[in-house]
């Protein structure tokens, strides 16, 4: 027989299958051009001295063989004597070590057995009604296919699934979507309606994240507020990495989980932009304001659960950095300016009230005045800080107020609103005899004492009604009692107390008259 022909004679070896575990397997035969065909197979076991024979039986019952030698691939033409338009049965017999090993048979029509490719190029993955939808372009000239998929998770073996018949320029498959674990998918195709056609190779892995991205388990710490009024947010613990199936380890496009940091600046609600989203790797500097921080995990199917923290405001106060002058036209604040063209946000809220009741005002960008100060003024009619109570004031500054992470804290302090000098007047002044020439003066704490750092001191004034002599006694803001000594019996005195702030002299309390009775000896 000629080597190019299928030989219709008995093969040159005895006809007996050894039934050994090794041998030829996975025979695939295809048409590779208009008139040429190729069969290929795998051989399991030692290859030395092995001769392969491709056997073919026609529908008429006549059988022939091609001698392939040691090769595991053989090509022939439509002139080789093999019926290509009708079904034939093919198998491989391998003669080795005086025994014959036989592959499983394939029955097919060679002319219509086109070598099908697996899905090539970009496989688009999307979510559809709780399932996974994969879509790809049908390889050229291969419309009409059966498609299978296999999938595995990091802890499970391959499972096989069916995509059903496909008959279009694009093909698709609905597959199961896991809630909490990543999956690796591979797809393969074979010709539709072609009896016995071989499956293509498996496609490259398609790596699919779980439907729910893993909840980020991270911890933050916030550094102390620096001299520049900013504090760094640092990540104490990185998010855990998603466990991946074997074929997705290393480069696994599709399974990436991205973690984003969402900052919400709670303070200064009158600024233009309150939230900003950043990549988790880029840890920002924050002002001393209160923030809510959320870490949002997302994958190609969208965002998952987020983890939220509250970062409280830095309450460190600067008692002397803010000057407040109250005039007939209104009130003006002065503080050391940060730089040229700064926008300031002045926020105030009554002490002891919920943070949600904060009020604020945004200044236009301003340059320092000749004394290097920045200012903010308001009229009495505006009602700002108009009530006679303690307010907590924070001033923030930014050269780029639209950028949330560029705000810094200028100062935080307390201020007593309204007519502080009158409101702060101490009440319930009482005088008690202390000794033959001294008295103890007590009073109720000034309302100013509820405002940390505002009350500078009390001043107690004693007036001798006879000589009209006046003495004044400064008292620490934490004290509400003083002893006046060196007094004379039988003389009428009046005592008054006032409460002073750093920038305002208080109003004297109502005069309290007293005298030390003359002691008559027996």
């Amino acid at each position: 027989c000629r080597t190019s022909e299928c030989c219709f004679q008995d093969p040159p070896y005895p006809d007996a299958d050894s039934g050994s575990a090794s041998g030829p397997r996975d025979l695939r035969c295809y048409r590779i051009s208009s008139d040429r065909y190729e069969c290929s197979w795998q051989y399991e076991g030692p290859t030395a001295g092995v001769s392969h024979f491709l056997r073919c039986c026609l529908s008429s019952g006549r059988c022939c063989y091609f001698a392939a030698g040691s090769a595991t691939r053989l090509q022939f033409s439509d002139q080789a004597g093999v019926s290509v338009l009708y079904t034939v049965t093919l198998w491989v017999e391998s003669w080795a070590r005086n025994q014959t090993e036989k592959s499983p048979e394939v029955t097919l029509q060679l002319y219509n057995s086109v070598k099908y490719e697996p899905p090539l190029g970009d496989i688009k993955v999307s979510k559809l009604a709780g399932q996974l939808r994969m879509e790809w372009e049908t390889p050229d000239n291969q419309v009409g296919a059966e498609v299978q998929f296999r999938h595995r998770t990091p802890s499970s073996p391959w499972k096989l699934g069916d995509c059903g018949p496909q008959d279009d320029d694009t093909e698709s498959c609905l597959c199961p979507l896991e809630m909490n674990v990543a999956q690796e998918f591979q797809l393969r195709r074979r010709q539709l309606g072609s009896q016995g056609s071989s499956w293509s190779k498996w496609s490259s892995p398609v790596c699919v994240p779980p439907e729910n991205p893993p909840q980020p388990q991270v911890r933050f710490s916030v550094e102390q507020l620096g001299q520049d009024g900013r504090r760094r947010l640092t990540l104490k613990e990185q998010p855990t990495q998603l466990e991946l199936p074997e074929g997705c380890q290393g480069l696994a496009p599709g399974t990436e989980v991205t973690y984003r940091l969402q900052l919400h600046m709670l303070s200064c609600p009158c600024k233009a932009k309150a939230t900003r989203t950043l990549h988790l790797g880029k840890m920002p500097y924050l002002s001393g304001a209160a923030y809510n921080v959320a870490v949002i995990s997302s994958n190609q199917f969208g965002p998952g659960l987020n983890q939220t923290w509250h970062i409280p405001a830095d309450t460190h106060t600067e008692p002397v950095a803010l000057n407040i002058s109250v005039g007939t036209n209104g009130t003006t604040m002065y503080w050391p300016a940060r730089a040229q063209s700064m926008t300031y946000c002045i926020e105030w809220q009554p002490v002891g009230q919920d943070g949600g009741l904060a009020t604020c005002s945004l200044t236009a960008p301003q340059d320092p005045d000749p004394a290097g100060m920045a200012t903010y003024s308001w009229s009495r009619e505006s009602g700002a800080m108009g009530q006679e109570k303690c307010y907590y004031i924070t001033i923030f500054a930014s050269a780029h107020p639209e950028k949330l992470t560029l705000w810094s804290t200028v100062l935080s302090t307390y201020h007593f609103g309204g007519n502080a000098s009158a409101a702060g007047t101490p009440h319930h002044v009482s005088v008690k005899n202390h000794s033959l020439d001294s008295v103890s003066v007590d009073w109720a704490p000034s309302l100013l004492s509820t405002c940390p750092g505002v009350l500078k001191e009390y001043v107690v004034r004693c007036r001798d009604e006879d000589s009209k002599q006046v003495s004044e006694h400064p008292v620490q803001p934490t004290e509400t009692q003083v002893t006046l000594s060196g007094l004379r019996a039988g003389v009428a005195y009046t005592v008054q107390v006032r409460a002073d702030t750093a920038w305002l002299r208080g109003v004297w309390s109502q005069p309290q008259r007293f005298s030390i009775e003359v002691q008559v000896s027996d």
């Epitope: 208009s34 008139d35 439509d78 290509v84 338009l85 009708y86 002319y111």
Partner: nanobody, 124 residues
Framework: QVQLVESGGGLAQAGGSLRLSCAAS????????MAWFRQAPGKEREFVAH????????NYADSVKGRFTISRDNAKNTVYLQMTRLKPEDTAVYYC?????????????????WGPGTQVTVEP
Amino acid sequence: QVQLVESGGGLAQAGGSLRLSCAASGRTFSNDDMAWFRQAPGKEREFVAHIDRNAASTNYADSVKGRFTISRDNAKNTVYLQMTRLKPEDTAVYYCAADPDHFGTTWYQQYTYWGPGTQVTVEP
């Protein structure tokens, strides 16, 4: 004497249609596999379509799949080739052939009986 005669060829515009017929005489062709081949100038004869004796199985060359349809009427001893969406590259002499051995091949030399052919010309 045994003979096959093709008809229906001619000039067609690209995108147009033609229907070729192959009438057999001299023997009963209803037991034979039938096929159409074509040969363009300077090229080898190439397989176009095949139909088995019962019209249960048909096969087409990739270049004509979806455009050409082979059929047969055994009572009339005739085989047809319906050609649609014609292209200039379909220009050739079309031959009808019979295979009484039912070998099922695309190799023209395996076919025993042949017609003289009919010219098909497709203009762009």
